[in-house]
């Protein structure tokens, strides 16, 4: 594989958004033949899904850079290479009164399917990204993003449901997709992996980054969730990955610094308001869109996912802390709360901007595989 | 549209015991089992007081006011909501709210209770 070179004007430089420094991009191999991320513990495969290698346990393959700048994820290198089997490490269930399917884990039993039938559906989230397969579409715009920036007063309530760490957002923070497209933001929570074990939900090109961030929204046309739940375009999500930087990210220490007070399952405390779109990467105009589902049980479809382009970084220590602080079920540490990419099942995924394009000098003509969708709309 | 319904509620000695139950209807009920589910309350006066809290896998926290004496349940098939609270003081009297945190809050209408003798 190429060495990754320096765009040195770079529109997406500077800030604390993440790198966007391109890596060169090999021959990728089909569809079929792409290795696929070793599926998370806790999550048995849906019908048809091989058990392929995975790549959890080795060495992350990323340019380090002294220079500002984003990662070009159209442009991530594929590891191949077999994986260790990865132990499961929330697999001590506690046996409660009232105990029933529905209390999922990412441990093993039960199936999700048997939580929630919707959770073998074939429009399931996350997906691999493979930026050479997604459908340019000049159509979408950037993102517009509406009262993000929270007085510290009233303060938030920062709680650890032993699945993830989620913060609840007031009314008020709104977030258009596009022209009559508008969302209202509920609560952010992030996936994260275990020392040395990326966590990310979202791949890209089989590429497991270090952790993820979703911010969750209920479309205007509906008042509350469970209204919206299976409908498509009810909610959308705004995922960014998140990734090892040389500096502390100030945003993110807002939230991160008070995880010790709620290792605990079920535990609780109210932050400051911050400002949430700090939280995502500072370019709204790139990214990746698909229709997916929610990636816990119920599983439900016709979840529009947001997958920025450009990265978000963190200090090493920033990502300890969030891998390593937390309790979940059962007396285990909540670790590796990523579910395995599910299968697009002839889902195009779109993107804003060309992302495959192989802008290397080698490309006689751009390459893009498949067209948009939503040209015209 | 009703989401969630607090029952058990009333007048008690000090000392004494009731079980609050909250049972969820209409869309709520589809949401039920993969929610955060919690009891708040709220004293003549006061703000809105976080009591109780339970996990959708059964984790469990209290306030240090009420931890030893209130227990938290629930029953995913019965889509309901419980708290169990004994050796009862003047100062748990409040109105009690269920609430259901699934991307967003679920609230109850709430049930008061009063301890007095």
């Known amino acids: 594989q190429r060495l990754p070179r320096m765009q040195e004007d770079s529109p997406l430089g500077g800030g604390s958004s993440g790198e966007d420094d391109p890596l060169g991009e090999e021959d990728l191999p089909s569809e079929e033949d792409s290795p696929r991320e070793e599926d998370p513990p806790g999550e048995e495969d849906l019908p048809g899904e091989e058990d392929l290698p995975g790549e959890e346990d080795l060495p992350e393959v990323k340019p380090k850079s002294e220079e500002e700048g984003s990662l070009k994820l159209e442009d991530l290198p594929t590891v191949e290479a077999p994986g260790d089997p990865q132990e499961p490490q929330n697999n001590a269930h506690r046996d409660k009164e009232g105990d029933d399917q529905s209390h999922w884990r990412y441990g093993g039993d039960p199936p999700w399917p048997r939580v929630s039938p919707a959770c073998a559906g074939r429009f399931q989230s996350p997906v691999d990204i493979r930026p050479q397969l997604a459908a340019f579409c000049p159509a979408l715009r950037p993102l517009e993003l509406l009262g993000f920036q929270l007085p510290p007063l009233p303060e938030l309530r920062l709680r650890n449901n032993g699945h993830s760490v989620q913060l609840t957002l007031p009314p008020g923070l709104e977030m258009a997709l596009g022209p009559g497209r508008e969302y209202r933001a509920l609560q952010l929570h992030l996936h994260w992996g275990a020392a040395g074990r990326p966590g990310s939900e979202h791949t890209v090109e089989g590429h497991r980054f270090p952790a993820e961030i979703h911010v969750v929204h209920l479309s205007t046309a509906f008042a509350r969730v469970d209204e919206a739940l299976g409908r498509p375009g009810g909610l959308a999500v705004l995922a960014a990955f998140l990734e090892e930087g040389p500096e502390e990210n100030s945003a993110y220490e807002q939230l991160l610094s008070r995880l010790e007070e709620i290792a605990e399952e079920g535990s609780e405390t109210q932050v400051p308001g911050l400002d949430i779109s700090a939280l995502l990467p500072s370019d709204f105009s790139r990214y990746f869109q698909y229709e997916g589902s929610l990636t816990t049980p119920p599983c439900a479809q016709g979840v529009i996912w947001t997958v920025f382009n450009q990265t978000v970084m963190l200090s090493a220590k920033q990502l300890h802390t969030l891998s390593d602080t937390l309790w979940g079920p059962g007396d285990s540490r909540l670790q590796l709360n990523f579910r395995a990419t599910q299968p697009l099942n002839g889902r195009v995924i779109e993107a804003s901007f060309p992302a495959g394009v192989d802008s290397s000098p080698r490309a006689a003509e751009p390459v893009q595989l498949n067209s948009c969708l939503a040209a015209g709309d | 549209q009703v989401q969630l319904v607090e029952s058990g509620g009333g007048l008690v000695q000090p000392g004494g015991s009731l079980r609050l139950s909250c049972s969820a209807s209409?869309?709520?009920?589809?949401?039920?089992?993969?929610?955060?589910m919690a009891w708040y309350r709220q004293a003549p006066g006061k703000g809105l007081e976080l009591v109780a809290v339970?996990?959708?896998?059964?984790?469990?926290q209290y306030s240090s006011s009420v931890k030893g004496r209130f227990t938290i349940s629930r029953d995913n098939s019965k889509k309901t909501l419980y708290l169990q609270m004994n050796s009862l003081r003047a100062e748990d009297t409040a109105v009690y709210y269920c609430?259901?945190?699934?991307?967003?809050?679920?609230w109850g209408q709430g049930t008061q209770v009063t301890v007095s003798s």
């Open positions: 609430n259901a945190d699934y991307y967003q809050d679920y």
């Open positions: 209409g869309g709520a009920r589809n949401i039920f089992s993969f929610a955060a």
């Open positions: 339970i996990t959708s896998a059964g984790g469990t």
